[in-house]
Each structure stands twice: as structure tokens, then as C-alpha cells.
């Protein structure tokens, strides 16, 4: 067997089992598990006289190591005295020694609960220049305790004179404070409050929590826009990760296909938001045919602040298809805004919800930033609807008074597009698509003053058409109300006017 140093244990009786009139008591020290022989046991009895007896070593059958017991009998005022048993094992090393200091007997005791509390962040969630850790040692039977602070398991040089002890009834509590610099706290080290009491060790540890609360992180994966898919024929999908806390760690986004086929090269963009969070987008070009044939694309997101990898997948929407109905309208002139008009486009009853809306003037597509389009909303039936709003200037309509609202949708035939033309002054314009048939729905402009309808373009509303029914969510004034009554005019007409 190889050299093995001993484990040393104090041997004491329970205090309640020692008669109060006992003039002498015996205590012991067990040295076990050592090899080879011998060990040397000596006692420090302080001011008291004592006799010692070391029993012959015995062999531990399983390991072949040795164990021995040394007994100390003392007389006199032993109750308040501490005794030290000193065990030396020179085969381990010439200076190998283990000291155990203990009293004659052990009392029943209630062990302490150890808990570390830390100072809070400031209102903005940032750490102050210094961080206080408070170690609460509570609910123990009064007696000597030793508190040690550790940093990543190493003893710290801390002034423990600030520790204070209070007694409540039969139990005591102690608290010790540790002040750390922000730099130390942010270094991700673990701080431990270690309490030694009645020969036992109790502890609690703490460290800086992860920078972000992962509850806020979200990932989304978009489908390609119908415009990119059917018109440009270069569809892309985008993986969006929002509400990340900026940190040392980077977001890792990995693309894959359910079929296992390779993916194209993706582009990535990171943006710091005004609220301090980070938004990461990765855009992947996909094959038009692959998408239409139902390939599933997956975006895998990992980040140090995410408890686990996230996966988002996207594929062509399944279910019934329905082509959009498109209606385009112009609002009347508004007092004080003679040189501007708002055009509106209602696109409804389409399925699935993926749709692209464009406005054209002079056969040229206007920039997306020019118009504002709502997100698809469900109709009372099974389809979806959107509104799109475009502001046009006098210069534009005087150049050519025809604006086209176009919807791109997979169910539209023959070329995945449906469009309607609208004029600012329909009576003056040379026949727009809008005036070719009576619309199923009529839009009225809800003026501030309720009054009689004013003719626009020589037409009047049907008496059953009324405003205020079914107002849509509209991005800014002027507000438009959908008239839900069917228009029953016999002649083809359109009407826009004050209600």
C-alpha cells in the first residue's frame, strides 16, 4: 500500500450524559486510514493536568491501513477548557500534522442557516460602483462561530470586525458584510460565505446573474413576401432575434432545410435599439420552386444568455386559398390641405394572409416608404383584410390623375396580382377602373361636422349607406369608415363625400 496520511476525529461524550459532580472526564482522538505506522499523538491540556493513553494501532481489514485512538483523562475545572489533540505522521512528511481543538463534551445544538443577500441595482438596472454582500447566519444555538469569505474557493482577506451577533430567545444570529468593487463583481467570480460551528461547516454562495433575463428574448422567422416570390422571383426569409442584452457573447444563427439539402449564403445585420437591446437579423435567399413545393426552412439561434438553443421553422402556408378583392378610393378635399390628398385601398377576403401591397403612378412603383399598410387582420368570415394609405401631392395628380393599388397574392390569377386604379378627381379623369362597376362597399369620409352629403363627381350616396359602421384601424387621419350596407345604385357610380 502507498503512503496515506490519517484522518483525525475528536471523540467526546454528550454533555448531558456527564454527571454534574464528575471530578474527571475522558475524551479522545481517532486517527484513521493512515499508512504506514506510526502516528504520534500529543495533547495540549492548557492549565490542567491530564493523563494520556494511546491504544495500539489496529489494521483496517479492507484497505490494510491503520487506525489508533489516544485517550486523555483530565480532572479539575474541565468544563470551560478547550483541548487540542495534535497528530503527526512523519511517513507522510516530516512536518505533517493535524490539530483538532475541542471541548470535553458536545451539546445538542441547532445548526445555523446561512444565506447571502446582495445589494440591489440602481433604477436603470445597472450595478453601482460597489456591491455589498450580506451573509446572514441565523437560528443557531449560541456558541462560537467563525465566518470566512471565499472568492472562487480561495480565502479572502476581509475585515471581520464588522460582524455583529444578536440573540433572540434561545437562538442567535450573526451577520457579516463584504464590499466588492463593481469590477470584481462583474468578473463572474463566485463568492461564498463559509461558517464553521461546532466542528461543522455551513455555507452559501452567490455570483452575478446572467446579464439578460432570457424571458425577454424572442426569435421570429418570416415567410418570403409575395412580391419577392412572384414578381421579383428572388424570395428571401428573415430570422429576427430581438431583446438581446448586448454582451461579450455573439448570437449564433444557423440555417438549415428539413430536406437536408444545402442552404444559400445568408446575410446578417446587428442593430442596437434605443432601449439598449440588440436586434439581430439574418436573411436567407431561398429558391422560388423550393418554397412553392413546400420546403421547410429552419433557423437555429444560440446565445450565452439563452438557456437553450431556439429553433424557428417556416414553410408555405397550408389550407384553403382565396384571391383578394381590391377597392381603391380617394378622400375629398380637406379644408387647409388643398395640395394633398389621401388615397385608400381596401384589400379583403384573401387567404392565406401573406400579401404584398404596392402603389403605382405613371406605371412606376412608388417606394414602400410612401404608403402605410396595416397588418393582415381576420375578417368575420375566414379570410383576411388590409388597408393601405397613400398621400399624393397636387403635382402628382396634375401630371397624371391615375394611381394604382396592386395586391400581390398567391391565389390571384392569372399572374398573382390584382389591381385597381383610383383618381383624385374621378369626374374629370378619363374613366378609371374604379368607375367601371358599383362597388360592394362604399367608403365615406367622416367629417368633423355632420351635415348633408356633398356630391363629389356628380354622384350621391344611396340612402341606405351610412357612415360610422365598421371603422377600421387606420394609421392616422383622416379616418375612414367602411359603410357596411350594400350600395344599390342602378347606374354605375362612386361616391366620396362628407357624412
Amino acid at each position: 500500500a502507498s503512503t496515506q496520511s490519517p484522518s483525525v476525529f475528536p471523540l467526546t461524550r454528550c454533555c448531558k450524559n456527564i454527571p454534574s459532580n464528575a471530578t474527571s472526564v475522558t475524551l479522545g482522538c481517532l486517527a484513521t486510514g493512515y499508512f504506514p505506522e506510526p502516528v504520534m499523538v500529543t495533547w495540549d491540556t492548557g492549565s490542567l493536568n491530564g493523563t494520556t493513553m494511546t491504544l495500539p494501532a489496529t489494521t483496517l481489514t479492507l484497505s490494510g491501513h491503520y487506525a489508533t485512538i489516544s485517550l486523555l483523562t483530565v480532572s479539575g475545572a474541565w468544563a470551560k477548557q478547550m483541548f487540542t489533540c495534535r497528530v503527526a505522521h512523519t511517513p507522510s512528511s516530516t512536518d505533517w500534522v493535524d490539530n483538532k481543538t475541542f471541548s470535553v463534551c458536545s451539546r445538542d445544538f441547532t445548526p445555523p442557516t446561512v444565506k447571502i443577500l446582495q445589494s440591489s441595482c440602481d433604477g436603470g438596472g445597472h450595478f453601482p460602483p460597489t456591491i455589498q454582500l450580506l451573509c446572514l447566519v441565523s437560528g443557531y444555538t449560541p456558541g462560537t462561530i467563525n465566518i470566512t469569505w471565499l472568492e472562487d474557493g480561495q480565502v479572502m482577506d476581509v475585515d471581520l470586525s464588522t460582524a455583529s451577533t444578536t440573540q433572540e430567545g434561545e437562538l442567535a444570529s450573526t451577520q457579516s458584510e463584504l464590499t466588492l468593487s463593481q469590477k470584481h463583481w462583474l468578473s463572474d467570480r463566485t463568492y461564498t460565505c463559509q461558517v464553521t460551528y461546532q466542528g461543522h461547516t455551513f455555507e452559501d454562495s452567490t455570483k452575478k446573474c446572467a446579464d439578460s433575463n432570457p424571458r425577454g428574448v424572442s426569435a421570429y422567422l418570416s415567410r418570403p413576401s409575395p412580391f419577392d416570390l412572384f414578381i421579383r422571383k428572388s424570395p428571401t426569409i428573415t430570422c429576427l432575434v430581438v431583446d438581446l442584452a448586448p454582451s461579450k457573447g455573439t448570437v449564433n444563427l444557423t440555417w438549415s432545410r428539413a430536406s437536408g439539402k444545402p442552404v444559400n449564403h445568408s446575410t446578417r445585420k446587428e442593430e442596437k435599439q434605443r432601449n439598449g437591446t440588440l436586434t439581430v437579423t439574418s436573411t436567407l435567399p431561398v429558391g422560388t420552386r423550393d418554397w412553392i413545393e413546400g420546403e421547410t426552412y429552419q433557423c437555429r439561434v444560440t446565445h450565452p444568455h439563452l438557456p437553450r438553443a431556439l429553433m424557428r421553422s417556416t414553410t408555405k402556408t397550408s389550407g384553403p386559398r382565396a384571391a383578394p378583392e381590391v377597392y381603391a378610393f380617394a378622400t375629398p378635399e380637406w379644408p387647409g390641405s388643398r395640395d394633398k390628398r389621401t388615397l385608400a385601398c381596401l384589400i379583403q377576403n384573401f387567404m392565406p394572409e401573406d400579401i404584398s401591397v404596392q402603389w403605382l403612378h405613371n406605371e412606376v412603383q412608388l417606394p414602400d416608404a410612401r404608403h402605410s399598410t396595416t397588418q393582415p387582420r381576420k375578417t368575420k368570415g375566414s379570410g383576411f383584410f388590409v388597408f393601405s394609405r397613400l398621400e399624393v401631392t397636387r403635382a402628382e395628380w396634375e401630371q397624371k390623375d391615375e394611381f394604382i393599388c396592386r395586391a400581390v397574392h398567391e391565389a390571384a390569377s392569372p399572374s398573382q396580382t390584382v389591381q385597381r386604379a383610383v383618381s383624385v378627381n374621378p369626374g374629370l379623369a378619363g374613366g378609371s377602373a374604379q368607375s367601371q362597376r358599383a362597388p360592394d362597399r362604399v367608403l365615406c369620409h367622416s367629417g368633423q361636422q355632420q351635415g348633408l352629403p356633398r356630391a363629389a363627381g356628380g354622384s350621391v350616396p344611396h340612402p341606405r349607406c351610412h357612415c360610422g359602421a365598421g371603422r377600421a384601424d387606420w394609421p392616422g387621419p383622416p379616418e375612414l369608415d367602411v359603410c357596411v350596407e350594400e350600395a344599390e345604385g342602378e347606374a354605375p357610380w362612386t361616391w366620396t363625400g362628407l357624412c
Partner: antibody, heavy 119, light 110 residues
Framework: QVQLVESGGGLVQPGGSLRLSCAAS????????MTWVRQAPGKGLEYVSI???????WYANWASGRFTISRDNSKNTVYLQISRLRAEDTATYYC?????????????WGQGTLVTVSS | DIQMTQSPSSVSASVGDRVTITCQAS??????LAWYQQKPGQPPKLLIY???TLASGVPSRFSGSGSGTEYALTISSLQPEDFATYYC????????????FGGGTKVEIK
């Protein structure tokens, strides 16, 4: 094939501590987020803690403070240290592997190790 | 925290029956609802992930459906080996949660 073998369970006195180990084989541990789930006798599954591939960890609210999850990829081992054990910690503790691609749950479980807390 | 509420807590059924177990989340889950089967003395086994994708080696009589907050596991024709306890799990830990597992549904022989 993928194997997860838990050890370190047994009978412990209230207030005591123990460290559970989970030896992983048949896959690259560093590629997977790992989770500990426990199940009290006759009860349902209860999530305890997760450690991601970066070594960062999260705990169920009730587990915070007494439970410590860690991993040593070089030893292909995941650990769960439990301190100040209570009777209600008596359960079978399962070490579990999260799917590699994420958001898809646990694709492999160990057989579990039983922890009994009793005086 | 997202809470998962599973119902019923137990169901008695016969071989050949169609059994549906539901799971309701307290908030919408973007992806990552999983279903597990557990037999006595064994660890759980993954049946379905990503709401509706069948795990490798799982018979096609098992199916998962749902979105948002409402999910279901259906066994189209119950077999003798299907008598077990079933758990749903919210497996999308970006929304870190205490109670990622439902309370379980025990499928017993009628």
C-alpha cells in the same frame, strides 16, 4: 448510441448535501444544452435546471440557491450539486439531453438516480 | 412564467379507442411544444416535438396539433402498449419558466 448514466443518489439526512453526476457517451456533449428533471414518487415531471452550451445556467425558482448545475465537457459529465437537502427533495433525478437544433424538447434521458432525504 | 395546464388528469379507454389529451399554455408558444410518454419505472420518451413532428421511431397513430396556447395529443387507435402517462412540455426556454411540464395524463385500461 447515446447514453446518459446518473450516479450519486442515495439516502441523505435533512440538511445534508450531495453531488449527482451524469456521464454522457455516444455524442459530443459540448454541442448540447443539458437539463436536470426530477420526479417525486408517484408525481409528475419537474424541471430543475438547465445549462447551455456556453456553460451558463438557469434554475427553477424553487431550486435557486440550493441547486448548482455544472458541466465538464472534457470529462463528458454534467453535475447537479444539492445542498441543505429537505424531505421534499426526495425524487428520482433524471439527466436529460436537449435536442441539438433547439426548441424541440428532450430527445434522450438517463435512467435516473434516486435521492432519498430522511432522518 | 408560462404555465402548462394538462387535461384530463386521467382517462380510461379501451384498445382501439381514439384518445385526445389537451395542454393549455398560459401564454402563446412560438415553437417547441413537445409530448412525452412515460411508463412505470422508466424515464420519459419523446413522442412529438415542434407541436406536431413525430419523433424518430414513434408510430403514426400518435399526432400532435395546435398553436398559440392550445395543443392536443391524439392517439387515433389505442394499442395495449400505449397505456402510460403522457406529459406535454413547453420546450422553448427563451421564455424561461418554472413549470415547463404539464401535470400529466394517465391513460388507463377501461
Amino acid at each position: 448510441q447515446v447514453q446518459l448514466v446518473e450516479s450519486g443518489g442515495g439516502l441523505v439526512q435533512p440538511g445534508g448535501s450531495l453531488r449527482l453526476s451524469c456521464a454522457a457517451s455516444g455524442f459530443t456533449l459540448s454541442n448540447h444544452d443539458m437539463t436536470w428533471v426530477r420526479q417525486a414518487p408517484g408525481k409528475g415531471l419537474e424541471y430543475v435546471s438547465i445549462i447551455n452550451t456556453y456553460g451558463n445556467h438557469w434554475y427553477a425558482n424553487w431550486a435557486s440557491g440550493r441547486f448548482t448545475i455544472s458541466r465538464d465537457n472534457s470529462k463528458n459529465t454534467v453535475y447537479l450539486q444539492i445542498s441543505r437537502l429537505r424531505a421534499e427533495d426526495t425524487a428520482t433525478y433524471y439527466c436529460a439531453r436537449e435536442t441539438h437544433h433547439g426548441s424541440s424538447g428532450i430527445d434522450h434521458w438517463g435512467q435516473g438516480t434516486l435521492v432519498t432525504v430522511s432522518s | 412564467d408560462i404555465q402548462m395546464t394538462q387535461s384530463p388528469s386521467s382517462v380510461s379507454a379501451s384498445v382501439g379507442d381514439r384518445v385526445t389529451i389537451t395542454c393549455q399554455a398560459s401564454e402563446s408558444i412560438y415553437s417547441g411544444l413537445a409530448w412525452y410518454q412515460q411508463k412505470p419505472g422508466q424515464p420519459p420518451k419523446l413522442l412529438i416535438y415542434d407541436h406536431s413532428t413525430l419523433a424518430s421511431g414513434v408510430p403514426s397513430r400518435f399526432s400532435g396539433s395546435g398553436s398559440g396556447t392550445e395543443y392536443a395529443l391524439t392517439i387515433s387507435s389505442l394499442q395495449p402498449e400505449d397505456f402510460a402517462t403522457y406529459y406535454c412540455q413547453h420546450a422553448d426556454y427563451a421564455h424561461h419558466s418554472d413549470n415547463v411540464f404539464g401535470g400529466g395524463t394517465k391513460v388507463e385500461i377501461k
